[in-house]
């Protein structure tokens, strides 16, 4: 059955109740330098209206402190008013090392990430840090990567593995789940000239992914106790027609295509999931498709196999899928793929339809073909117009945070948490944010803030308290943190 | 060595065709665009278009659509560009060069430059 | 078509001093945190080289004299400090959307 009635149950302490934010830009200096700058000045008010420095006078400064970056006062305000837990958002590679390489580290823009990990740990609210987060504008890559082939080129792997590094070198006693790429099976929308391209792109992330992964593992680890993994877009498919064959075959089709394409290298066998590697061949063999999965190596199997530390999955709705043979040697031909618009379903203004089932059928679906794996939801939301009652956004958090409670309490499915995307709106863009783009809130706030403070959907007479030790342990392993390195 | 290797000068009557080549080595020529230049003596650079040799897709500037053809033979690693209705005013040098379609799409590699003089 | 405007038309350099090159666009060639404009050099009866790329990167084996900056639509080229062999044609190109098109060239002269 599609939907369920809604169950009454809560999550367990230790969910994480989180917000996801895209790529902050760091700001290049502190905005508050009134309190750095040791002269006296007296203004002339009357005359020239300007200031003019009074000298032999030094008076006391005080530390330069990370709220005097604006940006970083703005977004623990917005934080403080979600009452989340986690706070998951991603650094800028291309600000932290302008050349690509180790050569050029920008050390302003690592203080300023610090600052907002070290502010938020004040409040209660632990990072979960993204290392790189392209999106379907913007590539994200240093310059001089973008002009050597970007992830075409199998060094691009190498130079991400050395600024992960560096990350978990200055954040990772701060930071203790890490995101390395960010939907990386979405960069064939970017990389979509032919299969072989996208296909291309999608070895060299995935090489990179376990480098960076290995590092950590190996050097990082054993003082830093994280866990690091990578975000996949996991879409749920269903089969348009529910009463023909050949649309089933499709929705599972596009679970390979989409999830399987990078979780099974990752999760499993350090190879292409077989089915999808089958389906291009067959294409190839017929003289539908030039596209070919690249042949991995043994050492290349070794390296992918077993890179994760749990399943993180960005969903936002569910596809009607039907099967349609395409021409053409690019990713989205090589699939076979028609996707259906449901006008009967309730969809926001960019078409993302609301099937709140859908999440429920994908985490059953990870655990049957992955194992009984944490599984934390990294961003899952919908754009809505509203600027104030955005009731969709409520409505969609409600009907899908109890689909994820269904598959917790009667799946047994281990989800650690959810992260709402997204915390603040850009301008121009489809309307995603709690917070309007000139940080208005909106009133889904509270709808969440409820959820969260009642740890889900209890029964009346249930408690939303948790042991108190349990409460406390992550704010005093903040302030010890805060108080070692500030 | 990346460089392109184009063909040598060629001398042609007014109203006929050329076809002149670009032979690329020491990269997978598949993967990047063959961008075609003009320049006249002593003035400036106009692009002409690009061809992708991937799939032989093609991209004009609207002044070059009627006038260059552009092709490229994957077994030889070698675009073609030809020009027709050749005038007096096409007595110019034409360049190739590669650019990253995906990346900067500036143009790293440069052939030598090919001489066409059109002349009765 | 985005129009490029370089300035000036020539100039005239002694050895060991700055050299400043212009390059205005008609409208923003800046997209996606990327700057899409690029320097090229070029010697008679050779092809033109490029020297920087994305507006502000240097182009491997190009000597660190050569530098670039700029966002949007105003661009400039500097050379410091400038030594003979840097006689030559520069041109800016842009590469922000179809046509290509590149600026008219500024001719360097070393006294």
């Known amino acids: 059955k599609e939907s369920t009635p809604d169950v009454q149950g809560q999550f367990p302490c230790d969910f994480s109740w989180g917000v996801t934010e895209s790529v902050l830009k760091p700001e290049s200096v502190a905005s508050s330098p009134q309190f750095s700058d040791p002269h006296l000045y007296v203004w002339n008010a009357t005359g020239n209206r300007l200031l003019h420095r009074v000298e032999g006078v030094r008076l006391k400064t005080r530390p330069a402190q990370c709220t005097d970056f604006v940006n970083i006062k703005k977004q623990l305000e917005m934080l403080a008013r979600m009452k989340v837990t986690h706070y998951r958002f991603a650094l800028d590679w291309a600000s932290v090392l302008p050349t690509g390489n180790l050569s050029a580290v920008n050390r302003q823009a690592l203080r300023y990430y610090r600052c907002v990990v070290s502010e938020g740990l004040k409040l209660g609210i632990s990072a979960m840090v993204t290392l790189y987060y392209p999106t379907h504008a913007h590539l994200g890559l240093p310059e001089p990567l973008l002009h050597a082939d970007g992830w075409l080129n199998p060094s691009t792997a190498e130079a991400f593995q050395a600024y992960a590094g560096l990350c978990f070198q200055e954040l990772g006693d701060l930071v203790k789940l890490w995101i390395t790429i960010n939907e990386p099976n979405r960069l064939s929308d970017i990389y979509n000239r032919s299969g072989n391209d996208t296909y291309g792109a999608a070895h060299n992330l995935l090489v990179a992914h376990a480098l960076a992964w290995r590092l950590y593992d190996r050097q990082f680890r054993p003082s830093q106790r994280g866990a690091v993994s990578l975000s996949l877009h996991a879409d749920w498919a269903e089969p348009a027609n529910p009463y023909a064959d050949s649309h089933w075959r499709a929705a599972e089709r596009f679970l390979q295509f989409e999830i399987a394409w990078f979780a099974e290298p990752l999760f499993k066998t350090g190879d292409y999931p077989a089915a999808m590697r089958e389906y291009i061949a067959s294409k190839h063999r017929r003289g539908l498709s030039s596209s070919a999965l690249p042949r991995l190596t043994e050492a290349e199997r070794r390296l992918l196999k077993g890179t994760v530390d749990f399943c993180a999955l960005n969903h936002f709705t569910t596809r009607f899928v039907m099967h349609e043979q395409l021409a053409g040697s690019r990713y989205d031909s090589d699939r076979d793929i028609q996707f259906l618009q449901d006008i009967t379903r309730l969809s926001s203004p960019t078409r993302l339809a609301v099937i709140p089932w859908g999440v429920r059928k994908l985490l059953r679906w990870v655990r049957r073909n992955y194992g009984d794996m944490d599984i934390y939801i990294t961003a899952s939301g919908i754009d809505d117009q509203a600027l104030e009652d955005d009731r969709l956004r409520k409505y969609y958090l409600g009907k899908y945070l109890q689909e994820v409670l269904k598959a917790y309490l009667i799946d047994k499915v281990r989800i650690k948490g959810y992260y709402a995307f997204k915390l603040a709106e850009e301008k121009s863009k489809p309307r995603f944010g709690f917070f309007t783009s000139d940080f208005k809130a909106k009133s889904s706030i509270q709808f969440y803030n409820k959820v969260i403070s009642s740890r889900g959907f209890p029964f009346e007479n249930s408690s939303s308290r948790c042991s108190q030790t349990q409460e406390n342990t992550e704010c005093t392993v903040c302030l010890f943190l805060v108080q070692k390195k500030p | 060595q990346v460089q392109p290797q184009e063909s040598g000068p060629e001398l042609v009557k007014p109203g006929a065709l050329v076809k002149i080549s670009c032979k690329a080595s020491?990269?997978?020529?598949?993967?990047?665009?063959i961008n075609w230049m003009k320049q006249r003596p002593g003035q400036g650079l106009e692009w002409i278009g690009w061809i992708y040799p991937g799939d032989s897709s093609t991209k004009f500037n609207e002044n070059f659509k009627d006038k260059a053809t552009l092709t490229a033979d994957k077994s030889s690693s070698t675009a073609y560009m030809q020009l027709s209705s050749l005038t007096s005013e096409n007595s110019t040098v034409y360049f190739c060069?590669?650019?990253?379609?995906?990346?900067?799409?500036?143009?790293?590699?440069w052939g030598q430059g090919t001489l066409v003089t059109v002349s009765a | 078509d985005i129009v490029l405007t370089q300035s000036p038309a020539s100039l005239a350099v002694s050895l060991g001093q700055r050299a400043t090159i212009s390059c205005r666009a008609s409208?923003?060639?800046?997209?996606?945190?990327?700057?899409?404009m690029h320097w090229y050099q070029q010697k008679p009866g050779q092809p033109p080289k490029l020297l920087i790329y994305l507006a502000s990167n240097l182009e491997s084996g190009v000597p660190a004299r050569f530098s670039g900056s700029g966002s949007g639509t105003d661009f400039t080229l500097n050379i410091h400090p400038v030594e003979e062999e840097d006689a030559a044609t520069y041109y800016c190109q842009h590469s922000r959307e179809l046509p290509y098109t590149f600026g008219g060239g500024t001719k360097l002269e070393i006294k």
């Open positions: 060069a590669r650019s990253d379609y995906y990346g900067s799409r500036s143009f790293t590699y």
């Open positions: 409208k923003s060639v800046s997209t996606s945190g990327y700057s899409y």
């Open positions: 020491g990269y997978t020529f598949t993967r990047y665009d």
